[in-house]
């Protein structure tokens, strides 16, 4: 007789990342009999919303429905019919939708209400949309990456299984670049954390850490745009800016009611003699630079030591994973090699700003040219970013390692917050046999 | 358990307006969503409108300009009224919880309050 | 608005029978499908929903199938506890529509 192959005891989890810019779907799998293990769930698809964030959404709510579909449609196909009603669906929005909850929680609310109902009427164990908070942001990605890495793992290896291991179980720092906020996050080297809004404690198998945290809204690679166009149209001598970030021959006509609709221009906004300009690439690296430098405000800091705007930050400690934008513009500009040196990374950036424009386009043909002109910039962000922003140095740069996934799974803040809404990240390390926890995360 | 009961039924003359009110236990309002919904006499349910958990609400075309829902979370009570009232009004009127947070099809109705509209 | 249609007013069944009701929707609703069952002087009690989801608690000879316009309960072995009016709802599109619902009797 055939032996059968016992059915597969596994179970499945959902979390929606809905962004500034667009939404993610992810699904993730686990072995039931191991939920308490470390590093057992894994991704087994992502899906791809096709559309801009939810919060582009509040002069629309009744397309929020139609919008989801297809990835939603994905996961009833991946995910076996049996498991439907036993898989949790969770939606968590970050900074797109803080900032709208800034300019009306009414809408917010609108908006959540309308993704909530959308989301109730497929057969899964729906949990809630909610607007996670930048401290959350960051400290799911900071698990994410750590529980990926096996870092909260207490079997110590003689060989590495996962890259960037450094076979220690000493946490990597958590980089995280979206396009409306940006998260910082590690545990500092016997340091106090100066401000308790930026102090997390985790107990997690067995192990207490202390973690520094700072989401920096507004900080993002699109919002951290639109502030310095607002910062530099204060000083145009017309409705011609000749921008640096942009590649010579390069020019886009932005109207002023797009740049003054997000809180993050609000502290540069006058009134401008005209309705339109024009941006004009002028390709300079070094301008660029040091037009972004501007956005961070150095001259003030009531702590030890400061990020930017008198945001406390301690000496930067060990391995940083630096994901989401940071990966996705550095992967495309070919800069995420660990063999590549800050210095390095500068000079091809420099290369990279001074191309005109009609080359680019040539070069990258099938790149949408909203995304294709915005390179120049948000690699220019990402440097000015970790070097003045975080105080990365040329030396520490070899520390920095530019993720896209760990063992198939995104890095990101997804995982990490579906591990703890599932009660999967034990404060205590698990016996042979498991058992039941009462505290998590 | 949860329960839903309805109240403020009874006897309306046409042209004048209700105002109903569905107590609910067993569950937040600041977790679920509430519709009302109607069953005229020997005829089918009509839906009316909803109230989701952040308080928007969504309403039947056919009942736009005279209705509106609302609720108190503190005291765990939706509320409907309808103005301008016809004779065909007349029904059962039901809330009902959403299954899932926000969901368009209900696990728990309450009792039912029936309005009778007549001169 | 979007018409559900339950063509059968009344059906005659025997204990034991398998009863089949069906619903017609005026367009495509995809599965966003539940069945109601309403018994006499009582509000109505969830069935199925996503065209083919048993809610919890439901007895399972109560099967719910079909996607896009035509859609069917079916109970496998009626039992005379099951004498209700059933009615089927579409939550596809606003404004939430109803069938006109399909009462069981005894033959």
């Known amino acids: 007789t055939q032996n059968k192959a016992l059915p597969e005891n596994v179970k499945y989890g959902i979390v929606l990342d809905a962004g500034s810019s667009h939404t993610s779907l992810y699904i993730y799998k686990w072995p039931a009999e191991k939920e308490n293990d470390t590093g057992v769930v894994h991704q087994v698809e992502e899906c791809r919303v096709k559309g801009p964030g939810i919060s582009k959404f509040v002069q629309k709510v009744n397309e929020i429905g139609i919008y989801l579909t297809d990835c939603m449609e994905r996961a009833r196909e991946v995910i076996p019919r049996s498991q439907h009603q036993e898989t949790p669906v969770y939606l968590g929005a970050t900074a797109g939708m803080r900032l709208l909850r800034m300019e009306s929680e009414e809408l917010a609310d609108r908006v959540l209400d309308v993704v909530e109902r959308s989301l109730s009427n497929y057969p899964f164990d729906f949990q809630g949309a909610r607007i996670i908070t930048g401290q959350e942001e960051g400290a799911y990605g900071w698990i994410t990456i750590n529980y990926l890495l096996g870092k909260f793992s207490q079997k110590t290896r003689w060989f590495s299984i996962v890259p960037y291991e450094t076979n220690n179980q000493e946490t990597f720092g958590a980089l995280d670049l979206g396009g409306a906020s940006t998260q910082v996050t590690f545990v500092p080297q016997n340091q106090t954390i100066e401000s308790p809004d930026n102090a997390l404690q985790f107990r997690l198998y067995g192990k207490d850490y202390n973690v520094y945290t700072h989401s920096f809204l507004c900080y993002g690679k699109d919002q951290a745009l639109w502030q310095k166009l607002a910062k530099d149209i204060q000083v145009a001598s017309n409705e011609i800016l000749r921008d640096p970030c942009f590649h010579p021959g390069y020019k886009k006509v932005v109207n002023v009611s797009d740049l003054y609709k997000t809180p993050c221009t609000k502290r540069f906004e006058m009134t401008l003699p005209f309705q339109q300009f024009e941006i004009q690439g002028i390709g300079n690296y070094q301008q660029c630079h040091q037009s972004i430098l501007e956005l961070f405000n150095t001259s003030y800091c009531p702590y030890s030591q400061c990020a930017f705007n008198g945001i406390f930050l301690p000496p930067l400690q060990g391995d940083f994973g630096a994901f989401s934008a940071f990966y996705f513009v550095m992967k495309f500009l070919n800069l995420t090699s660990e063999k590549v040196s800050q210095e390095k990374v500068t000079e091809m950036m420099k290369k990279f700003c001074a191309q005109p424009w009609e080359e680019i386009k040539t070069s990258y043909a099938g790149v949408k040219e909203k995304y294709l002109s915005e390179y120049c910039f948000s690699g220019t962000y990402i440097l000015s970013l970790l070097l003045q922003g975080y105080h990365f140095t040329a030396d520490s740069w070899e520390h920095i390692h530019f993720i896209g996934k760990i063992q198939g799974s995104d890095a990101g803040w997804t995982l990490g917050y579906m591990l703890n809404l599932t009660n999967m990240i034990p404060a205590e390390q698990p016996l042979s046999t498991p058992l039941s926890h009462s505290t998590y995360v | 358990q949860v329960q839903l009961v309805e109240s403020g039924g009874g006897v309306v003359q046409p042209g004048g307006s209700l105002r109903l009110s569905c107590v609910v236990s067993g569950f937040s309002l600041t977790n679920y969503g509430v519709h009302w919904v109607r069953q005229a006499p020997g005829k089918g349910l009509e839906w009316l409108g909803v109230i989701l958990r952040r308080g928007s609400t969504d309403y039947n075309a056919a009942f736009m300009s005279r209705l509106a829902i609302s609720k108190d979370n503190s005291k765990n009570t939706v509320y409907l009224e309808l103005n301008s009232l016809r004779l065909d009004d007349t029904a059962v009127y039901y809330c009902?919880?959403?299954?899932?947070?926000?969901?368009?099809?209900?696990?728990?109705w309450g009792q039912g309050t029936t309005v009778t509209v007549s001169s | 608005d979007i018409v559900m249609t339950q063509s059968q007013k009344f059906m005659s069944t025997s204990v034991g029978d398998r009863v089949s009701i069906t619903c017609k929707a005026s367009?495509?609703?995809?599965?966003?499908v539940a069945w109601y069952q309403q018994k006499p002087g009582q509000s109505p009690k969830l069935l199925i929903y996503?065209?083919?989801y048993r809610y919890s608690g439901v007895p399972d000879r109560f099967t719910g199938s079909g996607s896009g316009t035509d859609f069917t309960l079916t109970i496998s072995n009626m039992q005379s506890e099951d004498l209700a009016d059933y009615f089927c709802q579409q939550y596809n599109s606003y404004p939430l529509t109803f069938g006109g619902g399909t009462k069981l009797e005894i033959k």
């Open positions: 009902a919880k959403t299954a899932v947070v926000a969901g368009d099809y209900f696990d728990y």
């Open positions: 996503s065209a083919s």
């Open positions: 367009q495509n609703v995809g599965t966003n």
